[in-house]
């Protein structure tokens, strides 16, 4: 008695596919050992056709796969494009040889069944419409026409020309003639359901002179397309239901035993379990649409169905398309934080993993919006301008080759709470969803910039200081100038780092930036931040206004650019786990750093938070110290 279990008999017809599931005992050895599918020969030898080691025989090339699901203790063999030659005895098994643990499977592939010559075969999918053609002789032109369905020896009338319609075909069956045709009538049956399948007889006239035609109607269940996806990756269901339902509401549902629970529809319904990680996108005017789900979880595995109906809910007799989704827990996609917490006025650094083989791909960050179908407008990207409303507080730091990039958002408000997606123009499986939760701040920010009202005068020297606490003593401090294509890091020198860590003086931990002389193009957002290696931490931002010196006129405060950033301090919101090569700015000869200015910098720092993003810079008219 083998501990391996599977279907003993599998029967199908030519051209079809089979999906054979083999069950094995749940042990560590079994989960990781070789899985195989072999064909039993007359000589007792079992020839491997496919194995989990990557072997694929010539006769299975392009039409078979073997996928292990260790979390379910199963593996699945899919074989497509069956021919009668595939009929035979097989084994599915475990072990380094084909003599280990196995289960015998008999596969029988038959020819597509043939019917008597006078039988017309109609093959339709559930929910579709069939038009049965019924020929008759001129002598029966004025006789009663009917269509009946064979049930055993009896033939029960479905519809006839006296306007009788069987109740189970009400509003679905019509009998009609086309144009001036005198020798043919038609019966349409719409919204086909499985029980409509069977043998029909259409008849014109009565008794021995009646004309009869046989019609075999096959109503096909949607054969589920098998989708194999990794944990934390994404899946797209492409749904094409046909032009006849182009104007009906569309839905995607998940089969739950007896029911099919709607996950999303075009009428605004959405399952809370998919909040923030689902998009429904119409593809064209012919009713095609797609549903994208990101951040796949183990519990997302199952049977899915898309369909169309004015109610936006599954209805029997309406067209559907089906999938079976398997979620493989042995994922290549690293586990990253799904929830990131920040505080008002603070910042977050979000690590976005991507396929390391596609380091040159374009990276994006978008904000998922819960309108009726869900949408995700891009806020920032490696070649995309920062979206309006995010200037000065959002940046994407690409770290080619590292398999991750970092997005920094600062000057946080509670309106920033929500779901965000990391995505690239490459491998679409690597889409990750992050929920950002922004709470009201309860303490002073860790990074503070002075002076808080930063107005520099053209031609003069301007110094701005960033105060940081001792907990950041060992981290690298930086200043960068924000622009629409990144936050370009300035060479920095950290005054506080010269002290021994034992005697850290909270009041003298400062990193300064000096502009000398100030130029008009120095105006803009500057960020002060900390990082450890390539792991980005907190940032704060300050808007530096630049004005002409006017004789006798007082300094004018900058427009309230910093106001949005000074509502509240910030807690350290998250840790990132990404490396990045720091982009060093090319030094302008005008730049200098004077240690004395650090000592003289005012210590009345105001609360000030901002956001930024890093990129590479050509030249920069600022230095940081």
């Amino acid at each position: 008695q083998s501990p391996i279990f599977g279907p003993q008999d599998v029967s199908s017809i030519e051209g079809n596919s089979v999906s054979i599931t083999c069950y094995y005992p749940d042990t560590s050895v079994n989960r990781h050992t070789r899985k195989y599918w072999c064909r039993q020969g007359a000589n007792g030898y079992c020839a491997t056709l496919i194995s989990s080691n990557g072997y694929l025989s010539k006769e299975y090339s392009g039409r078979a796969s073997l996928i292990n699901f260790p979390e379910n203790s199963t593996f699945v063999i899919n074989i497509a494009h069956l021919t009668q030659e595939d009929t035979g005895s097989y084994k599915c098994g475990l072990g380094t040889t084909n003599r280990g643990l196995f289960f015998d499977v008999s596969l029988e592939v038959s020819q597509v069944p043939e019917f008597p010559n006078d039988t017309h075969v109609y093959t339709k999918d559930i929910g579709r419409t069939v038009t049965i053609e019924c020929r008759f002789k001129e002598g029966n032109a004025h006789s009663k026409k009917s269509l009946c369905k064979k049930r055993g020896e009896a033939c029960e009338v479905v519809i006839d020309s006296t306007e009788y319609v069987d109740p189970s075909y009400k509003d679905r069956a019509i009998l009609f003639m086309k144009g001036t045709s005198r020798d043919i009538f038609y019966v349409n049956i719409s919204h086909l359901i499985p029980s409509d399948a069977g043998l029909y007889v259409c008849q014109a006239g009565e008794g021995p002179s009646a004309d009869k035609n046989n019609a075999d109607l096959q109503v096909l269940e949607p054969e589920p397309e098998l989708l194999y996806k990794d944990l934390r990756s994404s899946v797209t269901f492409e749904c094409d239901l046909g032009r006849e339902v182009a104007n009906d509401a569309k839905y995607l549902c998940r089969k739950n035993k007896e029911t099919c629970d709607v996950i999303i529809n075009t009428l605004g319904k959405r399952d809370p379990a998919f909040e923030g990680r689902i998009l429904l996108t119409p593809r064209d005017d012919n009713g095609r649409f797609s549903v994208l789900i990101t951040g796949l979880r183990k519990e997302d595995a199952g049977h899915y169905q898309c369909g169309a109906h004015s109610s936006g809910l599954p209805q029997e007799g309406w067209p559907v398309q089906a999938w079976q989704l398997f979620v493989n827990e042995e994922s290549t996609i690293p586990n990253s934080r799904s929830v990131v917490k920040g505080v008002t006025g603070g910042s977050v650094a979000i690590v976005c993993p991507y396929n390391p083989k596609e380091s040159s791909s374009l990276k994006y960050w978008c904000h998922w919006e819960a309108d009726e179908n869900g949408r995700c407008p891009v806020l920032v990207g490696t070649q995309a301008l920062v979206q309006e409303g995010y200037e000065g507080r959002l940046a994407l730091f690409d770290q080619p080759g590292s398999g991750a990039y970092t997005v920094i958002l600062n000057q946080l408000t509670t309106q920033d709470s929500g779901f965000y997606w990391c995505l690239t123009d490459g491998d679409s499986r690597w889409r990750t969803t992050i929920e950002l939760q922004v709470a009201e701040a309860t303490k002073k920010p860790d990074l503070e910039v002075t002076p808080q009202n930063a107005t520099a005068v053209i031609g003069e020297t301007f110094t701005i200081s960033c105060h940081y606490p001792c907990k950041f003593y060992s981290q690298e401090k930086y200043w960068c100038k924000w622009s629409n294509d990144g936050c370009h890091i300035l060479p920095s020198h950290d005054e506080g780092a010269r002290q021994s860590s034992v005697s850290c003086d909270q009041s003298s931990q400062i990193v300064s930036m000096t502009l000398n002389p100030v130029k008009k193009e120095d105006e803009g957002w500057y960020w002060c931040g900390v990082k450890e290696g390539q792991v980005y931490g907190e940032t704060t931002a300050i808007y530096v206004a630049v004005e002409e010196r006017t004789r006798g006129s007082p300094h004018i405060n900058p427009t309230d650019a910093n106001a949005r950033a000074k509502d509240a301090p910030e807690e350290e919101a998250m840790e990132s786990s990404v490396r990045e090569d720091e982009n060093k700015a090319n030094l302008d000869p005008r730049l200098f750093a004077d240690e004395r200015e650090i000592q003289n910098a005012g210590d009345q720092a105001q609360e000030n938070r901002a956001s930024g993003n890093a990129g590479s810079a050509g030249g920069q008219s600022g230095s940081s110290k």
Partner: nanobody, 126 residues
């Protein structure tokens, strides 16, 4: 919803044959995985055989104890599943239950099935 009614049980001699039928109500019979389970006197309910289908592909699963002796089949037109039992043995004595479900992860597990018939008694005397 689906209602299941078993029939065909009875008292037979060892070596004889019986055919059990399970008639299912409901218009979506073809969407169900259909199984036969049995409960011998004083024992737990155990798996006997299951039939499932996808389009025109049929999968049949059997317990080791009945392999080669029992055959499961279906007639979609009659919404009925059959269990042909040959070479019956006294240890086949049990109440035989028909079960149905739309989704089954492991066909051997009784808790995977949502709908059950009332059962039909099969007694095999030696």
């Amino acid at each position: 919803q689906v209602q299941l009614v078993e029939s065909g049980g009875g008292l037979v001699q060892a070596g004889d044959s019986l055919r059990l039928s399970c008639a299912a109500s409901g218009r979506t019979f073809t969407t169900y995985v259909m199984g036969w389970f049995r409960q011998p006197p004083g024992k737990e309910r155990e798996f006997v055989a299951t039939i499932s289908w996808s389009g025109s592909t049929t999968y049949k699963y059997y317990a080791d104890s009945v392999k080669g002796r029992f055959t499961i089949s279906r007639d979609n037109a009659k919404n009925t599943v059959y269990l042909q039992m040959n070479s019956l043995k006294p240890e086949d004595t049990a109440v035989y239950y028909c079960a149905a479900s739309t989704v089954v992860a492991d066909p051997r597990a009784p808790n995977e099935y949502d709908y059950w018939g009332q059962g039909t008694q099969v007694t095999v005397s030696s």
